[in-house]
């Protein structure tokens, strides 16, 4: 009862390999690395057949089919390029993930190269089967600012030079505060922007005083205060988080985070700002932007900005001591002794940024918080100091530069 000679499948082998096979002999069919046994459209690792009493084999020899990793997973804010001809997705094929430059960059400078493994999964040398991450690029506007002139009372900002600025707007389109985009779905603003003005006689924060996420919206890519343009993105609010140590009486820790319902499309007019890497030096020049009141108490038509120096903390404390106002460690002051250049009503929550010349990148130093009137002599603008609360911001948002 001898069974016919067996031919191993292409890219496969049979074991044991014998010259002759007799009744009850069994053989195991397996495939080379990167191939799978295919029998009746079912993939398996091995297949066993037996020599029957009547001298026939219990089954036909299966085929060996190359492993297919199939279409690779999509990468958020990324692209896939196939390194192999005809966009092959089979064993040993190679693909490369890249991020949508210049607005996204790959985390940890990963190569993004994935190879189709013998197990049928796309594998990267460092990340294994995990996909890379495309992080938003921060603080690198496409449009670079002309050198700032030392000018009185601010000047119109050039369009696109402050792509991180956010406008907090009532649903009727009335702006009420500023903010800055962090990462791909967070806005940092002033905590006092998210509640109604409190009664000085009873400065307690009640539920009814707080803005609900459905009460306002965020507008990014905005230039004109009231006019719309094609670069604007209007986004809903998912959740608001006030700093847990915020004090509405003293404006201590006057910072809040707004989580967006959806991520904006990053482009030349919408880009996040970088979080500070270290403390800010006294005398450093910063730029403050906003749609707040101008000289003569008028609101501007477009986004305005001023360039002012950071003021020594003790100088600022002394300036406010006669008013019995405390300038705490979570605050940073900026402005000129003679006054004239300052943030004002409507600017609250907006960004105070500085340029790191070595990297050519802009960093958030503070958010507009409070002051005594606007642009007064010997009364500096007081800002919530982002470096002081960077840990909290990162805890809540997970944003890293």
């Amino acid at each position: 009862n001898e069974c016919p000679e067996l031919q191993p499948p292409v890219h496969g082998k049979i074991e044991p390999s014998q010259a002759k096979y007799f009744f009850k002999d069994q053989v195991l069919v397996s495939c080379d690395t990167g191939y799978k046994v295919l029998k009746d459209n079912v993939e398996m690792d091995t297949f066993q057949i037996e020599c029957l009493k009547d001298g026939t084999w219990s089954n036909k020899i299966p085929t060996c089919k190359i492993v297919d990793c199939r279409a690779p997973g999509e990468l958020e804010h990324g692209l896939i390029t196939f390194s192999t001809r005809n966009n092959l997705t089979t064993y040993k094929s190679e693909i490369k993930y890249s991020c949508q430059e210049p607005y996204y960059k790959m985390l940890n400078n990963n190569t993004g190269i994935y190879t189709c493994s013998a197990q049928g999964v796309w594998m990267n040398k460092v990340l294994g089967r995990s996909l890379p991450t495309c992080l938003p690029v921060c603080g690198l506007p496409k449009f670079s600012r002309k050198l700032m002139a030392r000018i009185f009372n601010g000047r119109p900002a050039q369009k696109g030079t402050t792509p991180w600025i956010a406008m907090l707007s009532h649903l009727n389109g009335q702006p009420f505060c500023g903010g800055s985009l962090l990462g791909s779905s967070w806005i940092v603003t002033a905590a006092h922007c998210l509640h109604q003005s409190l009664d000085p006689e009873d400065p307690t924060l009640r539920d009814s005083d707080l803005l609900s996420p459905s009460d306002f919206k965020i507008i990014l890519g905005k230039h004109w205060r009231l006019r719309s343009d094609e670069n604007e993105q209007h986004l809903g609010v998912k959740h608001t988080t006030l700093h847990p140590q915020y004090d509405p009486n003293t404006f201590e820790n006057d910072v809040a985070l707004v989580e967006l319902l959806e991520s904006p499309v990053l482009n030349a007019f919408v880009m996040p700002i970088c979080l500070p890497e270290g403390p800010q030096q006294e005398g450093a020049m910063v730029i403050v932007s906003g749609w707040g009141k101008q000289f003569l108490q008028r609101f501007p038509e477009t986004l305005m900005e001023i360039e002012i120096p950071i003021v020594d903390h003790s100088t600022c404390q002394k300036a406010y001591a006669p008013l019995k106002k405390k300038v705490t460690r979570d605050m940073i002051c900026a402005g000129e002794k003679e006054g004239g250049k300052d943030a004002c009503a409507g600017d609250a929550g907006g960004p105070m940024v500085t340029l790191n010349r070595e990297r050519g990148q802009w960093y958030l130093v503070g958010t507009v918080s409070w002051g005594d009137d606007c642009g007064k002599k010997d009364r500096y603008g007081v800002y919530s100091y982002i470096h002081h609360n960077k840990d909290w911001i990162q805890r809540v948002t997970g944003v890293r530069n």
Partner: antibody, heavy 113, light 112 residues
Framework: QSVEESGGRLVTPGTPLTLTCTAS????????MNWVRQAPGKGLEWIGI?????STWYASWAKGRFTISKTSTTVDLKITSPTTEDTATYFC??????????WGPGTLVTVSS | AVVLTQTASPVSAPVGGTVTIKCQAS??????LAWYQQKPGQSPKLLIY???TLVSGVSSRFSGSRSGTEFSLTISDLECADAATYYC??????????????FGGGTKVEIK
């Protein structure tokens, strides 16, 4: 880094009592400090917090019954007019963005006539 | 003010088992929730903040999660040393300026 409470003792109802919290390894003047209490066999109850600036916030049930204050080296909790319900272990705990990351061992206050 | 309602005590599980404690917030508090462990005669110890971030030095057997206003603390591969009372704490700045921090009632975990 550590904190320690002191001043807990047996007092008669209505007799004001001040508890003190001292710290080592960090400065209380720039810290945010909570007071929390725990009655025997019961859960934790937040009393209030004092900010770096010195401003204070209290739980609604604690307003008027407790006063938190600070010096450069201590944070104090005054129980203005203790009642038997104020018998508890009182903890001071450093506030780290809303969470209490460093606790003292607690000091026991017993209010009894 | 935000009210936190915890799983009723005691919760019992064997050594090597898994236990999950729940904490329900009366309103949306985002992820502003922490978990503490308190052993008899000791002060509380912070385990988790931001609903799911483990404090440095705390065993990875502890994990936290959030689903809307319901928060969970899971302890896996239970050890005798895990026998304690666990508290959730809210630090979301919302309603009144009072009650800036609130604790749940606590859940006692017993190891069989």
């Amino acid at each position: 880094q550590s904190v320690e409470e002191s001043g807990g003792r047996l007092v008669t109802p209505g007799t004001p009592l001040t508890l003190t919290c001292t710290a080592s390894g960090f400065s209380l003047s720039s810290a945010y400090m909570n007071w929390v209490r725990q009655a025997p066999g019961k859960g934790l109850e937040w009393i209030g917090i004092i900010y770096a600036s010195g401003s204070t916030w209290y739980a609604s049930w604690a307003k008027g019954r407790f006063t938190i204050s600070k010096t450069s080296t201590t944070v104090d909790l005054k129980i203005t007019s203790p009642t038997t319900e104020d018998t508890a272990t009182y903890f001071c705990a450093r506030d780290d963005y809303g969470t209490a990351d460093l606790w003292g061992p607690g000091t026991l206050v017993t209010v009894s006539s | 003010a935000v009210v936190l309602t915890q799983t009723a005590s005691p919760v019992s599980a064997p050594v090597g088992g898994t236990v999950t404690i729940k904490c329900q917030a009366s309103q949306s508090i985002g992820s502003s929730l922490a978990w503490y462990q308190q052993k008899p005669g000791q002060s509380p110890k912070l385990l988790i903040y931001g609903a799911s971030t483990l404090v440095s030095g705390v065993s990875s057997r502890f994990s936290g999660s959030r689903s809307g206003t319901e928060f969970s603390l899971t302890i896996s591969d239970l050890e005798c040393a895990d026998a304690a009372t666990y508290y959730c704490q809210n630090y979301y700045l919302s309603s009144s300026s009072a009650d800036r921090r609130t604790f749940g009632g606590g859940t006692k975990v017993e190891i069989k």
